[in-house]
């Protein structure tokens, strides 16, 4: 369970995968899409709101066996809208949804390869945002295996505004 | 509760090796993140390595780097420290040291061993 | 590397005192900051993470604030028990580094 309804922190940034391409947001037929692209250099990266969030993850409660304190964080790009796990679609989307946020929106944050970050989706361990086809996707990454896999990695270039809402 | 116990220091000749380990009980040892962090006599906190919690990520302070290896045992609830190639410089109190969080290093260390201080002199 | 700055670097006060210890990171570390108070011969023992949350058994007469790259520990009314060295760290960037400390002792 998420240990408390407020965020420790919140930070705002830009998102770009392991190889320097942005995650970027944009509104079609009023639902949002993601997109995976190469920016040109005169265009301004998209912020994305990251809260942090502490929970206490009894091991019986997942598959892996991870039990203890973990950071766990949601995305915003805008207001109401909060990057969601598909798990049956194995896709990543933008949701408008009002808090409490479904478990969906949260994500296992975890620090990988010096400054890089992975997000694990709460509702189905060992399941990470990826990159697949230039778009966002869920992948199963086996735990014996090395987590460090590029296309799991992401980059988080901190905005320096005051985060209370953006776009 | 939460302990960490180090063991292995003493003095040892410039040049040579030592291995340091940390018995680790009182939580879900494979759930975290381990750190080593030294403190020479009289001086201030230095980081010096870190292995995730499944041991698949290890990095290194690049003055210990190609010299130290860190590496850790699940079953045996034990984080180790092999030291080679020893330096005058080196000679600290090592802590181990546990991650708040399980897969982040964001939140700090809440966890120390009580130390164990190496040595290397002529 | 991240360059963590400690000022004081020492502070003489009496029981009761409030007691205020600032720490500058050389570069944005978001609010991903630790205090440790260490007393000698023993190891380091957490107070605050993430600039402001107070960890778990430590009294609430401790309290952090700041984020960005300043940021301050503060000790409400200082107790017999509080004389020791105070660290601060960022977790921010890799690799972690710590402040060089401040000492506070007894007037």
């Known amino acids: 369970s998420i240990t408390g309804i407020s965020p420790i922190t919140e930070s705002l940034a830009s998102l770009s995968t392991y190889n320097d391409q942005s995650i970027t947001f944009a509104l079609e037929d009023e639902s949002y899409e993601i997109y995976v692209e190469d920016l040109k250099k005169d265009k301004k990266k998209d912020k994305v709101l990251l809260s942090y969030y502490e929970s206490q993850h009894p091991s019986s409660e997942s598959g892996d066996g991870v039990d203890g304190k973990m950071l766990m964080v949601t995305l915003s790009p805008t207001k109401d809208f909060w990057l969601q796990a598909n798990n049956k679609e194995h896709s990543v989307e933008l949701h408008k949804c009002e808090k409490p946020l479904p478990d969906q929106a949260f994500f296992v944050l975890h620090n990988r390869s010096f400054n890089c970050v992975s997000f694990e989706c709460k509702t189905d361990p060992g399941v990470f945002i990826g990159v697949k086809d230039n778009h966002l996707a869920l992948i199963k990454v086996d735990y014996s295996e090395n987590l460090g896999s590029e296309n799991i990695l992401f980059k988080l270039s901190e905005i320096l505004e005051h985060h209370h809402h953006h776009h | 509760q939460v302990q960490l116990v180090e063991s292995g220091g003493g003095v040892v000749q410039p040049g040579r090796s030592l291995r340091l380990s940390c018995a680790a009980s009182?939580?879900?040892?494979?759930?975290?993140?381990l750190h080593w962090v030294r403190q020479s006599p009289g001086k201030g906190l230095e980081w010096v390595a870190l292995i995730s919690y499944d041991g698949s990520n290890k990095y290194y302070a690049d003055s210990v780097k190609g010299r130290f290896t860190i590496s850790r045992d699940n079953s045996k609830n034990t984080l180790y420290l092999q030291m080679n190639s020893l330096r005058p410089e080196d000679t600290a109190g090592y802590f181990c040291?546990?991650?708040?969080?399980?897969?982040?290093?964001?939140?700090?260390?809440?966890?120390w061993g009580q130390g164990t201080l190496v040595t290397v002199s002529s | 590397d991240i360059q963590m700055t400690q000022s004081p670097s020492s502070v003489s006060a009496s029981v009761g005192d409030r007691v205020t210890i600032t720490c500058r990171a050389s570069q944005g570390i978001r609010s991903w900051l630790a205090w440790y108070q260490q007393k000698p011969g023993k190891a380091p023992n957490l107070l605050i993470y993430a600039a402001s949350s107070l960890q778990s058994g430590v009294p609430s007469r401790f309290s952090g604030s700041g984020s960005g790259t300043d940021f301050t520990l503060t000790i409400s009314s200082l107790q017999p028990e509080d004389f020791a060295t105070y660290y601060c760290?960022?977790?921010?960037?890799?690799?972690?580094?710590f402040g060089p400390g401040t000492k506070v002792d007894i007037k």
């Open positions: 009182g939580f879900t040892f494979s759930s975290y993140g």
């Open positions: 760290q960022q977790a921010n960037s890799f690799p972690p580094t």
């Open positions: 040291a546990k991650s708040l969080y399980t897969t982040s290093w964001y939140g700090g260390f809440d966890y």
